[in-house]
């Protein structure tokens, strides 16, 4: 059987087994034929007439081979005493099995008194004369455990006490737990313990490309079965479990930490160039921030903010903008403002002085608006608003920015206060307003800011007009919009008017004129 190592198997011996018998006229070495008329060797005894039989049949010396406990599998036939006339009282239907340990072969010098009895063995099925037809003999198989053993070898002996008996085969074996891999730990084969209840602890070795999660151990039972697995190994980073082994992650897959999990496909915008990848490298122009986990997609810096508008009020300017159209795959966008003063021309600019004040701050702005104060009067300024995310500082490319140029003055136009709707269509709205009460100079243009209601922070649009009326096109039907208007002079932009809400017309239903 599996997990069994034979020390002796007489069924593989051709001819006499060469065992010792004592006394004479006890056990006989006899060649028989089996059910298929193949020759088989047996030892037989049938001294059923005389009482007090004591016939011994002893095996040759069997080396122990490191086994602490062995098993004897005896195949035998035993004749029913009732089938033999006139022997009741002297005929027996059992025999005894004994063993003797020794460190060397003792030859013929063993004595009955040295042997230890293992058990008395009876047949599960004895047979009568009526059962003898065409060699249909009732074969009995009995297994007995012997142990604990400590010497280099041993003998087994059969003691006949008056039975009609044939020993057809003897197999002596020990059990071992076979080498196996369990929980990614390799356990080498282990010989079972010395008694029927003992468990032998065996420590496992993690298979290639795996590491201990908890010390892997199993226990080898007396029956040659592995029991109670404790602890385990897990595949290392870059490897996944497949059929009791750890296999490298394939190209395009990765595993970042040791564990039970399988290799995962590389996140978006990344790749693995070699097997057994622990992380996936970002594609060209894509990056992973220091705190991004390996499972995160690679991202890139954002594009420039859009719709940057300025509102000059004397020596202050309010800047407003919309988020970039491409956030680079990230949500951690902030804004930086760069202020440049251009005394002579826009091509010759310098950094603004330290006296310039930015509200709330100049860098890491979370909101898309900024007040810049303490500017010089009647001075040209260029403001750059750059969008920044968690990987902007990893890119060697210059940052994208929106630019607006302004000239400070002492007074910008006042607020446009009267604004009304002239007409509203499905996709356009016409507006009409009055010039500010204090233009403070020649009004160069008007700027209309509009956006879907409640969506100003997401996106807004602007439109320029040189008169006090304008039609805004490209709107969505049936949608409520917010409109604001402001004036611009050479001194800068005034404040936006109060918001005015207008709803575009709903689309007309189409009527089916077919009958």
């Amino acid at each position: 059987g599996r997990g069994e190592v034979n020390l002796l198997d007489t069924s593989t011996i051709h001819g006499d087994w060469g065992w010792l018998t004592y006394p004479a006229h006890g056990w006989d070495s006899i060649n028989e034929v089996d059910e298929s008329f193949r020759p088989i060797h047996t030892y037989q005894v049938c001294n059923v007439m005389s009482p007090n039989q004591n016939n011994w049949l002893r095996t040759n010396w069997v080396p122990r081979d490191g086994a602490r406990r062995v098993y004897a599998e005896i195949k035998f036939t035993l004749r029913d005493c009732n089938s033999i006339p006139g022997v009741l009282g002297t005929c027996k239907e059992t025999f005894n099995l004994h063993y003797l340990e020794s460190d060397r072969d003792l030859g013929a010098s063993t004595q009955e008194s040295q042997f230890l009895k293992i058990d008395t063995i009876a047949a599960d099925e004895s047979f009568t004369g009526a059962d003898l037809g065409v060699r249909r003999l009732k074969l009995n198989t009995e297994v007995r455990g012997v142990g604990p053993l400590s010497k280099r070898g041993f003998y087994l002996a059969f003691q006949d006490i008056g039975a009609c008996l044939a020993i057809l085969s003897l197999r002596i074996y020990y059990k071992k737990c076979p080498a196996m891999v369990r929980n990614l730990a390799a356990f080498s084969e282990a010989v079972t313990g010395a008694d029927s209840s003992s468990l032998v602890e065996v420590r496992g070795q993690c298979v290639r490309h795996s590491e201990e999660r908890d010390t892997p151990k199993m226990y080898c039972s007396a029956e040659g079965e592995w029991l109670v697995p404790i602890g385990k190994c897990v595949c290392s980073a870059g490897y996944e479990e497949r059929r009791d082994a750890c296999m490298a992650c394939e190209l395009g897959f990765y595993k970042s930490a040791p564990g039970d999990q399988l290799c995962a496909r590389c996140p978006p915008h990344s790749h693995s160039a070699t097997p057994a990848a622990q992380t996936c490298r970002c594609d060209l122009s894509y990056y992973r921030a220091a705190l991004d986990p390996p499972s995160a997609a690679c991202t890139r810096p954002p594009s420039a903010p859009v719709n940057l508008i300025s509102s000059v009020n004397g020596t202050s300017v309010t800047l407003e903008w919309a988020p970039p159209l491409d956030p680079g795959g990230r949500s951690d966008i902030t804004y930086n403002a760069v202020c440049r003063r251009c005394p002579w021309a826009l091509s010759h600019c310098e950094a603004c002085g330290s006296g310039t004040r930015f509200v709330p701050q100049q860098t890491s702005l979370a909101q898309a608006s900024l007040l810049v104060a303490n500017l010089l009067a009647h001075m040209n300024y260029s403001f750059w608003i750059e969008a920044v995310n968690g990987v902007s500082n990893l890119s060697p490319e210059p940052r994208s920015a929106a630019v607006v140029n302004i000239t400070t003055n002492q007074a910008a136009p006042s607020q446009v206060v009267v604004i009304r709707q002239e007409r509203a269509g499905q996709t356009s709205v016409s507006l009409l307003w009055q010039e500010p009460e204090q233009p403070n100079g020649i009004i160069l243009e008007y700027e209309i800011k509009y956006y879907e209601k409640d969506k100003e922070m997401q996106s807004y649009s602007t439109l320029k007009a040189v008169t006090t009326r304008a039609t805004v096109s490209g709107l969505k039907p049936g949608t409520r919009y917010v409109f604001q208007v402001r004036a611009r002079t050479s001194a800068g932009c005034g404040r936006f008017s109060q918001a005015m809400e207008v709803e575009t017309g709903k689309p007309r239903p189409r009527y089916d004129t077919r009958t």
């Epitope: 006229h25 028989e32 034929v33 008329f37 037989q44 049938c46 001294n47 059923v48 007439m49 005389s50 009482p51 036939t77 035993l78 004749r79 033999i84 006339p85 006139g86 022997v87 002297t90 004369g129 009526a130 059962d131 003898l132 037809g133 065409v134 060699r135 003999l137 009609c164 008996l165 044939a166």
Partner: antibody, heavy 121, light 106 residues
Framework: QVQLLQSGAEVKKPGASVKVPCKAS????????MSWVRQAPGQGLEWMGW????????TYAQGFTGRFVFSLDTSVSTAYLQISSLKAEDTAVYYC??????????????WGQGTLVTVSS | EIVLTQSPATLSVSPGERATLSCRAS??????LAWYQQKPGQAPRLLIY???TWATGIPDRFSASGSGTDFTLTISRVEPEDFAVYYC????????FGQGTKVEIK
């Protein structure tokens, strides 16, 4: 060497008795039963019965009760067949044969050379 | 009592030929059957017991089979020393012999 030794030929008158000995050697006499077989001149074999050499208990075949007696002297490993009131039809060779019981079956495995008993007036 | 009938009464064969002897019981004897060989002036000799098991020292040209009521003794290639009378014998509670088959030279 296992053997059974019988006495020489006997000539007896009708009505007389004869005691045929069978001496065993080469094995433990009490470990095997002893059987007796008759063979009339030119005829086949007839089983007369057997005796348990350990208990001395005899078993007789049909037609061999009454005048035929099996006995033992274990001290000299000898079995005996005694026939009384001899008749002419008792003229035959009488064989003793050792009975062998085995796991696989029984048989008479060792035979004496036979004793010819002639009954003639 | 169980009656054993052997056939044929006489079997004539040449040396080297196959000889087949039959023994039929009046009722089942299972495998409790033995075969004996007797040569003129000699005691019988046990050939087979248990219907098919060779006795000690019997050559393997002798083989036997059967169970219940029909039994066969076969001599695969008859040798000169095999010419003799062959008896079957059953051993139940009471033992009986067949009347014998004489194997003679053809």
């Amino acid at each position: 060497q296992v053997q059974l030794l019988q006495s020489g030929a006997e000539v007896k008158k009708p009505g007389a008795s004869v005691k045929v000995p069978c001496k065993a050697s080469g094995y433990t006499f009490t470990s095997r039963a002893m059987s007796w077989v008759r063979q009339a001149p030119g005829q086949g074999l007839e089983w007369m019965g057997w005796i348990n050499t350990n208990t001395g208990n005899p078993t007789y075949a049909q037609g061999f009760t009454g005048r035929f007696v099996f006995s033992l002297d274990t001290s000299v490993s000898t079995a005996y067949l005694q026939i009384s009131s001899l008749k002419a039809e008792d003229t035959a060779v009488y064989y003793c044969a050792r009975v062998r019981f085995t796991v696989y079956g029984d048989g008479m495995d060792v035979w004496g050379q036979g004793t010819l008993v002639t009954v003639s007036s | 009592e169980i009656v054993l009938t052997q056939s044929p009464a006489t079997l004539s064969v040449s040396p080297g030929e196959r000889a087949t002897l039959s023994c039929r019981a009046s009722q089942s004897v299972s495998s409790n059957l033995a075969w004996y060989q007797q040569k003129p002036g000699q005691a019988p000799r046990l050939l087979i017991y248990g219907a098919s098991t060779w006795a000690t020292g019997i050559p393997d040209r002798f083989s036997a089979s059967g169970s219940g009521t029909d039994f066969t003794l076969t001599i695969s290639r008859v040798e000169p020393e095999d010419f003799a009378v062959y008896y079957c014998q059953q051993y139940g509670p009471s033992w009986t012999f067949g009347q014998g088959t004489k194997v003679e030279i053809k």
